[in-house]
């Protein structure tokens, strides 16, 4: 599978310093590759813009939680 092996890696080198409203967010994906300098979250907005954010920040964790909760009802 050479295409998969040589697939480009997306990295975040800078994080947004602005809190983004959850109403503007459509999805997220985590960046975990060892080829990247830091772990990150990439949010995709409802207008398909991608924004790098720091997963250690509470608003980022809350936003990820919100996006996940939209698709399933929690027990607690």
């Amino acid at each position: 599978q050479p295409d998969a092996i040589n697939a480009p890696v997306t990295c975040c080198y800078n994080f947004t310093n602005r809190k983004i409203s959850v109403q503007r967010l459509a999805s997220y994906r985590r960046i975990t590759s060892s080829k990247c300098p830091k772990e990150a979250v990439i949010f995709k907005t409802i207008v398909a813009k991608e924004i790098c954010a720091d997963p250690k920040q509470k608003w980022v964790q809350d936003s990820m939680d919100h996006l996940d909760k939209q698709t399933q009802t929690p027990k607690t």
Partner: nanobody
Framework: EVQLVESGGGLVQAGGSLRLSCAAS????????MGWFRQAPGKEREFVAA????????YYADSVKGRFTISRDNAKNTVYLQMNSLKPEDTAVYSC?????????????????WGQGTQVTVSS
């Protein structure tokens, strides 16, 4: 390099209990939702339970609700699955995984970095 190592499986009689552990390394554990899945011989991988990054929200498959409890200790980089009132149909290999994509907690494609699994066998 991300690693997940499960432990705590074994052979138990129906009605018994087990506590599974999944120790994670190579990532900032406290910022990731985690899930437990299981796979019985000849069957597809099945969602069991999941927990959000802070541990405040938990999610369960209908088949284990009221019997299984998922929890996490972010200081120890470990997620747990307490399994009570075990049934023969709970027999499977249980694996933990890291959730890296938004969406349903019960969907395996949303997860990555699967552990090697731990065997749980429930005899009648």
């Amino acid at each position: 390099e991300v690693q997940l190592v499960e432990s705590g499986g074994g052979l138990v009689q129906a009605g018994g209990s087990l506590r599974l552990s999944c120790a994670a390394s190579g990532l900032t554990f406290s910022t990731y939702p985690m899930g437990w899945f299981r796979q019985a011989p000849g069957k597809e991988r099945e969602f069991v339970a999941a927990i959000n990054s802070g541990g405040s929200s938990t999610y369960y498959a209908d088949s284990v609700k009221g019997r299984f409890t998922i929890s996490r200790d972010n200081a120890k980089n470990t997620v747990y699955l307490q399994m009570n009132s075990l049934k023969p149909e709970d027999t499977a290999v249980y694996s933990c995984a890291v959730k890296i994509y938004s969406g349903s907690y019960s969907s395996p494609p949303g997860y990555n970095y699967w552990g090697q699994g731990t065997q749980v066998t429930v005899s009648s």
